[in-house]
């Protein structure tokens, strides 16, 4: 603790100029004071001034008023500093002395004589209010006041609490009257060294080094650090914890960059056609009548369906078509004839049969010819009779289908199973695909036919097909293939368009 006992001398009266021994001072009592402050004693005794002592210069002669003086010699109030916990009780001895010698340092002069003394014993609390008193004896009167205050930076009832206001990284506070800390705005904690972060800043995921700040820890973002950061490269996905990549609906792959719902995201099919998804970035447009092209973007000619009969020529119009009929025919599609068999209307050896009592006719065409007047040569490939991508070829009166590998039959309708030969080694599962068989290998094997035994690095054997990227340590199978567009499967071995029930990983 640390404080100051202050004694303010106000007035001393010694009208007769007498000493304590009854003698008078010549020419007058040149008066100075000795003050002794010590611990409380019921009976004041001689001995050391345990709380301090102080002397004044000569303050006046006989009777005088003592003025306040803040510095230098003769300072008033008198200061008795202490550096212990103030006990709340004290004993004070004030002695008035006459000196024949030096005004400034009467203590050192020989022949000093006591004029009077007073003793005060009691309790005194620390505070700014002065306690005023007056003591009389037969010859003298002394008016004075006193108090105990704490030294700078000391606080509390006994001046025992040290507190120094500060505003640095070890504390941001001022001191209360009792010595407790009062944090500056924006700071908290026992020593006011903890900043109060931006309101709402996430307790675990954010922190601050100064008030109203919110700095995010790794993996978190946003004004309040309450939004996780998804895996770097995550395109169409979100996270609930940092570095996750949970795909949005319609997206797949490690980075949610494979479009499983191209139709919805891109609307590639035009002119009211129907879009069907078929794997990552795969889709098919089914055109409405009158449209063609990959995206049904091409409008068909209104004449494309050959609506004009009997050799009529078709002309496209804005929203329709018009048939120009040959001589002897009329009607919207030149379907009505003004000819009879007498006009020999049947071409290419067709035989004419009269109808409606000779007012019209019908032609019976020889093989390889067709049309109302047998005017058209039959193209047996127009009906697209070949399935599974087979090519149709006209061969005289008949046609043949040239099948793609893996298919057979008159119309290429029969599928040749590549799996019948059991091409997959080590218990691999075989799947018939358009381009041949594909094997799904058991754990520990890889290769197109499961012929490669995996040893240490699961990606070293190149288990991913079709240019896929291999990652290890991401799944129980030791590797994961990130498929390029157009392929799926645990090894990206399946082109888009597999049966939907087939399992795959991406």
């Amino acid at each position: 603790g640390s404080g100051i006992f202050q004694l303010r001398l106000q007035e001393f009266v010694n009208q007769r100029g007498m000493l304590a021994n009854g003698q008078s001072c010549e020419p007058g009592c040149r008066t100075f004071f000795r003050i002794c402050l010590k611990h409380f004693q019921a009976t004041f005794s001689e001995g050391p001034c345990t709380f301090g002592n102080v002397s004044t210069p000569v303050l006046g002669t006989n009777s005088f008023v003592v003025r306040d003086k803040n510095s230098g010699s003769g300072r008033n109030p008198l200061q008795l500093p202490f550096n212990f916990t103030w006990p709340g009780t004290f004993s004070l001895n004030i002695q008035a002395w006459h000196t024949p010698g030096d005004d400034l340092r009467p203590e050192t002069s020989p022949g000093n004589s006591l004029i009077s003394q007073i003793i005060i014993q009691g309790s005194l609390a620390v505070g700014k209010i002065w306690r005023t008193d007056e003591q009389n004896d037969t010859l003298t009167r002394l008016s004075y006041s006193y108090r105990v205050i704490c030294s700078d930076n000391y606080y509390g009832e006994s001046c025992s609490r040290l507190c120094k206001k500060r505003d640095d990284h070890f504390g941001h506070y001022e001191c209360q009257p009792d010595g407790s800390l009062s944090c500056l705005p924006g700071w908290t904690g026992k020593y006011c060294d903890q900043p109060i972060c931006l309101s709402g800043c996430h307790e675990q995921n954010g922190y601050c080094s100064k008030p109203d700040e919110c700095i995010c820890r790794p993996g978190w973002q946003g004004r309040l650090c309450n939004e996780c950061i998804p895996h770097n490269g995550c395109r169409h996905g979100t996270c609930s914890i940092p570095w996750q990549c949970a795909c949005d609906e319609g997206w797949g792959g490690l980075f949610c960059d494979q479009d499983l719902n191209y139709c919805t995201h891109h609307s590639p099919c035009k002119n009211g056609s129907t879009c069907s998804n078929s794997g990552p970035k795969g889709y098919t447009c089914t055109c409405l009548p009158g449209y063609t092209g990959e995206h049904c973007e091409l409008g068909l000619s209104k004449c494309a369906s050959n609506p004009c009969r009997n050799g009529g020529s078709c002309k496209d119009q804005e929203n329709s078509y018009h048939c120009l009929c040959p001589p002897g025919y009329y009607g919207q599609h030149c379907e009505h004839s003004t000819l009879t068999c007498a006009d020999s209307p049947c071409f290419n050896g067709g035989s004419c049969r009269e109808r409606n009592q000779g007012s019209s006719y019908a032609c019976e065409c020889p093989p390889n010819f067709t049309g109302s007047n047998c005017e058209k040569k039959v193209d047996r490939c127009t009906s697209n009779p070949c399935a599974n991508g087979g090519q149709c070829q006209n061969r005289g009166p008949s046609r043949t289908c040239r099948c793609r590998p893996g298919f057979t039959g008159t119309h290429c309708e029969l599928h040749i199973s590549d799996c019948a030969r059991s091409p997959c080694a080590h218990g691999g599962t075989c799947h018939d695909l358009e381009n041949g068989p594909v094997c799904t290998c058991p754990a520990g094997f890889s290769g197109r036919r499961c012929e490669v035994r995996i040893t240490h690095d699961a990606c070293a054997s190149g288990p991913c097909f079709n240019g896929a990227t291999c990652y290890t340590g991401l799944s129980p199978n030791n590797f994961v293939c990130n498929c390029p567009y157009g392929f799926v499967g645990s090894r990206c071995e399946f082109p888009v368009g597999l049966p939907p029930s087939f399992p795959w990983v991406a």
Epitope: D152, G189, Y191, K210
Partner: antibody, heavy 121, light 107 residues
Amino acid sequence: EVQLVESGGGLVQPGGSLRLSCAVSGGSISSSSYYWGWIRQAPGKGLEWIGDIYYTGSTYYNPSLKSRVTISVDTSKNSFYLQMNSLRAEDTAVYYCAREDVILRGGSDYWGQGTLVTVSS
Amino acid sequence: SYELTQPPSVSVSPGQTASITCSGQRLGDKYASWYQQKPGQSPVLVIYEDSKRPSGIPERFSGSNSGDTATLTISGTQPMDEADYYCQAWDRDTGVFGYGTRVTVLG
């Protein structure tokens, strides 16, 4: 018992840089009660405070060295670091790391053994 | 910049009292710490918060701080107290050390 161990000292060319490490054991660098400081002492001279860091990464530097100094922390390694660039002969000193305690009003109660950095060609 | 001034050296006889001063503008309004450093060793904190001793520091070390001066007092000085002593305070966010005082125990 808390221990601080410096490493990374040695001979450095003038104009070069140094990176010193201070490994803390026996206590967590992430405690809210401490700052972690670097102090240096040139041969035969007094102590000079370089700067300090809190576990969150807040840093404070001696204004006279601020332009050349970076202090960083790695809580996962319970270590903090001093990077100093554009070194000159007068940077030759023993470099100490120390723990500054908020409760001790910034007094440094634990010090490392020091690592000597000599800047010379 | 803030400076702390110490006498370069203080000599004391064994068993006597050594007082080391540390002066700085309004130093009494800051908390002073004192460090002891023996040759070839790291500094050791002997006084913090003006007058408090860390555990393990002998009672003969005491400190005070008011006005512009902090004082480290070693009463009953022993030969083992011969060392360099540094005062330290914080000026805003910067640590400041005094220049150091070499205490020599005579005899």
